[in-house]
């Protein structure tokens, strides 16, 4: 007889999830021979720790605390680039700018990106079918409080002036309920951060409006003052333009506005 | 069952060039790095260098660099390397390897043999 | 580069027979990080790509017979077949897996009478 099985409203763990997360992590501490002594069947054994055998609703940042020991990695703290949906930008950003890095530039953040995944409570099982999802189920689930964790810890790090790409295109420039705005945001420390820099990407070419003037960034720039931590924003007008001239900088046409 | 199947092998004449193609089963070349090593006649394994067919990033021996280009076409699942400017020097068996989710080189291609001869 | 040095370059053996080989590097492939020397030794038959033997210089791969035992520490590695089969026939490399450019050792050519 088949064992009932909580259907959740997302998307089922990632195929191939196992072999994904242990060929990503020996991949990673190839290019990055600062992390070849770390011992990727143990990060694996550890992340699977983390959510096998317990119930998805039920997920806790200390769940996550054997992965994060494992996976612990010093990255230059004034060289930290926060994104908020504008992923894909952000990571061409420091493919160029190598000495940039965000969250999925880490180990912990590549182990992950973009994949899903959830257990089943008591069975050593992966579900494959479905996974809860944040709004739908329930906030505590394995994907949701990995990046709640990484994401703090990331935040945590970072010192001097901290860069966030933030997205121009949306009705909410800054959105409070994103990672950066309900994570990162609150947890940089500012008897180490000076400034957080806000570069807002414009999506229109013809859009030539100063988006910093936008009032979800004005709420940024309070939230950011209140903390002791200076804010500056400049806009993005050609996101196309700014990753040239980032690979090309000493072309003529990069000295003007991007 | 992971696997890399190569293309076959290449009779060449000196100063030209050439591209050897790698072909990846069982899993997807975007999870790990692809790297070439060289082995000339009675002689030792050369490692050549390795591209990440994520971002095309590559990696080569300092010896290869004027030599060798690697590419990718994750689409394909392939990998590439072109030799140029051919001499009987380059005259071997290339291998493309991968270690996929082992520490270590686990799996080779069955290797191209390369002959460059006028 | 770290130069990878392999002694004998050949030897022959009788089978049943106990075989060692050497391999010295110029370098040391110890990582302080984690104690784990980054040296593999690899087993090529005539006409085949290398098989994986041993990596972090003592850990035999799974299916590796275990009259196959590697050894060692920092730039000297020793591999040893307790009891030569006749299959063993082969060409023996070791390869520096600690730096960049992975360097491999000339070899060792052993031979069955």
């Known amino acids: 007889v088949p064992r009932w099985r909580q259907q959740w409203s997302g998307p089922g763990t990632t195929k191939r999830f196992p072999e994904t997360v242990l060929a990503r992590c020996v991949k990673y501490t190839e290019i990055h021979p600062e992390m070849r002594h770390v011992d990727c069947q143990s990060v694996w054994d550890a992340f699977k720790g983390a959510f096998i055998s317990k119930h998805p609703c039920n997920i806790t940042e200390e769940d996550y605390q054997p992965l994060m020991k494992l996976g612990t990695q010093t990255v230059p703290c004034n060289k930290i680039l926060l994104w908020s949906r504008i992923k894909d930008l952000a990571h061409q950003f420091t493919q160029v700018q190598r000495d940039m890095f965000t969250l999925e530039d880490t180990l912990l953040g590549y182990l992950a990106d973009d994949l899903t995944w959830c257990g089943e409570f008591n069975t050593s099982k992966i579900n494959y079918q479905s996974c809860p999802d944040w709004r739908k189920d329930c906030s505590n689930n394995p994907v949701s409080v990995f990046w709640k964790t990484v994401s703090r810890r990331f935040a945590e790090a970072a010192c001097d002036v901290v860069h966030v790409m933030l997205n121009g295109s949306r009705s909410k420039i800054f959105d409070k309920n994103s990672t950066f705005g309900s994570v990162e945001v609150h947890n940089l420390q500012p008897e180490k951060v000076q400034t957080l820099e806000a570069w807002v990407i414009h999506g229109g070419r013809e859009d030539s409006r100063d988006l910093c003037q936008d009032p979800t960034i004005k709420e940024l720039e309070s939230i950011i003052s209140k903390r002791n931590i200076q804010f500056s924003c400049k806009n993005i007008y050609r996101p196309d333009k700014f990753l040239q001239c980032v690979k090309n900088p000493e072309d003529s046409s990069c000295t003007s506005e991007i | 069952e992971v696997q890399l199947q190569q293309s076959g092998a290449e009779l060449v004449r000196p100063g030209a060039s050439v591209k050897l193609s790698c072909t990846a089963s069982g899993f997807n070349i975007k999870d790990s790095l692809i790297h070439w090593v060289k082995q000339r006649p009675e002689q030792g394994l050369e490692w050549i260098g390795w591209i990440d067919p994520e971002d095309d990033k590559t990696k080569y021996a300092p010896k290869f660099q004027d030599k060798a280009t690697l590419t990718a076409d994750t689409s394909s699942n392939t990998a590439y390397l072109q030799l140029s400017t051919l001499t009987s020097e380059d005259t071997a068996i290339y291998y493309c390897?991968?270690?996929?989710?082992?520490?270590?080189?686990?799996?080779w291609g069955q290797g191209t043999t390369l002959t460059v001869s006028s | 580069d770290i130069v990878m040095t392999q002694s004998p370059s050949s030897l022959t053996v009788t089978a049943g027979e106990k075989v060692t080989m050497s391999c010295k590097s110029s370098q040391s492939l110890l990582h302080s990080g984690n104690q784990r020397n980054y040296l593999t030794w690899y087993q090529q038959k005539p006409g085949q790509p290398p098989k994986l033997l041993i990596y972090w210089a003592s850990t035999r791969e799974s299916g590796v017979p275990d009259r196959f035992t590697g050894s060692g520490s920092g730039t000297d590695f020793t591999l040893t077949i307790s009891s030569v089969q006749a299959e063993d026939l082969a060409v023996y490399y070791c390869?520096?897996?600690?730096?960049?450019?992975?360097?491999f050792g000339g070899g060792t050519k052993l031979e069955i009478k």
């Open positions: 390897v991968s270690r996929y989710i082992n520490y270590y080189f686990a799996y």
């Open positions: 390869q520096n897996d600690y730096d960049y450019p992975y360097t």
